[in-house]
């Protein structure tokens, strides 16, 4: 399986809520012995392999943030932490994922990145990630609601997200 | 390791337009991190003016809105502070600064040694 | 804007001595946990330099003997013993809202 960025950069107001979006495509395995780990969590730009260095989103870790469950089967965070922070992830039986950000500043600005773990009961862990940029706009330069850039495999055309 | 050198008249008229230029060697500035202008005033009191992101977007002082703008030239590495309708009241040591960006601190970790602007006539 | 008020405006220490610069935001300058405050060091005719940032956290290189505590809206700057070298302006800066502040600064000089 693979993991999908529908959009590469989200562009927000101060103040707006945003979700960044992953998607899990190819052939899932919903066998019983099969699970799925999601998460979320902010990386650099300034290195070798996007994504590979884990920070975490609101002082909240990737295993605060995680998803935990089998094949395409929908899910949701821990509501009260997350929540306390403004923060909620979320996965439905399509395979989209999710991380909702609430009432955005410009200290939210970054790169994120989506993380999904297929782990085999007994075998090994299968590992994929996707990364998008969101940033945080400040001032009269700044659009009215999000802006999202789908990623370039897609469409380039700008879409303004609702 | 990463430098920042700032250039640019040290004289202005009046009424007239700022240009300084950042030329920051030993790290691209397309990479990461946030690229700023800082200056200070006689008498040392300090003020943040804005930030070019590696990206290219920016973010201003709300103060000087309407007549600050920072744009960058990737191929030569640099960025530029433009500010118009300069009055006595800008003139102070202007710096470019590099800032984190998009992790759990933001703060000037490298600073140019800054280039000294007088408005006069 | 979040304004930045620093105490004492200067302050003379003798060799060996503590020295505590305090720094107070008119709000909060935490997020989610995460404290936003930083110190800078400036000696005539250099650009400032950073000390601390995240209230507490030493940048690398930078002597021990310097400090920082505090949280919401009061923090302060320790520098224990002083040293001849410490002779300078500090400034404390808040990125917690834009636009970014600094404090008014503290001229830190020998008894």
């Known amino acids: 399986f693979k993991v999908a960025t529908p959009y590469s950069l989200y562009v927000c107001p101060e103040g707006q809520n945003v979700t960044l979006t992953c998607r899990l495509l190819g052939p899932v395995d919903k066998g019983h012995d099969v699970t799925f780990y999601k998460t979320w969590y902010r990386s650099s730009r300034g290195e070798v392999q996007t994504c590979s260095e884990r920070r975490p989103i609101r002082n909240l870790t990737f295993q605060d943030l995680h998803l935990h469950h089998g094949g395409h089967q929908a899910a949701n965070t821990s509501h009260d932490l997350a929540q306390r922070h403004g923060l909620e992830s979320a996965s439905d039986h399509h395979g989209n994922f999710s991380i909702t950000m609430r009432n955005l500043t410009l200290l939210d600005s970054g790169l994120y990145c989506c993380l999904v773990v297929e782990i085999r009961h007994h075998h090994s862990e299968h590992r994929v990630h996707g990364a998008m940029e969101l940033q945080v706009q400040t001032g009269k330069d700044a659009p009215s609601n999000c802006v999202v850039y789908p990623s370039s495999s897609q469409d380039s055309e700008n879409i303004t997200a609702a | 390791a990463v430098q920042l050198q700032e250039s640019g008249p040290g004289l202005v008229r009046p009424s007239q337009s700022l240009s300084l230029t950042c030329t920051v060697t030993?790290?691209?500035?397309?990479?990461?991190?946030?690229w700023n202008w800082i200056r200070q005033f006689p008498g040392s009191k300090l003020e943040w003016l804005g930030f070019?992101?590696?990206?290219?977007?920016?973010n201003y002082n709300p103060s000087l809105e309407s007549r600050i703008s920072i744009t960058r030239h990737t191929s030569k590495n640099q960025f530029f502070l433009h500010l118009n309708s300069m009055t006595t009241e800008d003139t102070a040591t202007y710096y470019c600064?590099?800032?984190?960006?998009?992790?759990?601190?933001?703060?000037?970790?490298?600073w140019g040694a800054g280039t000294t602007v007088t408005v006069s006539s | 804007d979040i304004v930045l008020t620093q105490s004492p405006a200067s302050l003379a220490v003798s060799l060996g001595q503590r020295a505590t610069i305090s720094c107070r935001g008119s709000?909060?300058?935490?997020?989610?946990?995460?404290?936003?405050m930083q110190w800078y060091q400036q000696k005539p005719g250099q650009p400032p330099k950073l000390l601390i940032y995240?209230?507490?956290n030493v940048e690398s290189g930078v002597p021990a003997r310097f400090s920082g505590s505090g949280s919401g809206t009061d923090f302060s700057l320790n520098i224990h013993p002083v040293e001849e070298d410490d002779i300078a302006m500090y400034f404390c800066q808040q990125s917690r809202k834009v636009p970014w502040t600094f404090g008014g600064g503290t001229k830190l000089e020998i008894k």
């Open positions: 995240g209230a507490s």
């Open positions: 030993d790290y691209s500035i397309t990479s990461d991190y946030a």
């Open positions: 600064a590099r800032s984190l960006y998009g992790g759990s601190h933001w703060y000037f970790d490298v």
């Open positions: 709000e909060s300058v935490e997020y989610y946990g995460t404290i936003l």
């Open positions: 070019i992101g590696y990206s290219g977007n920016t």
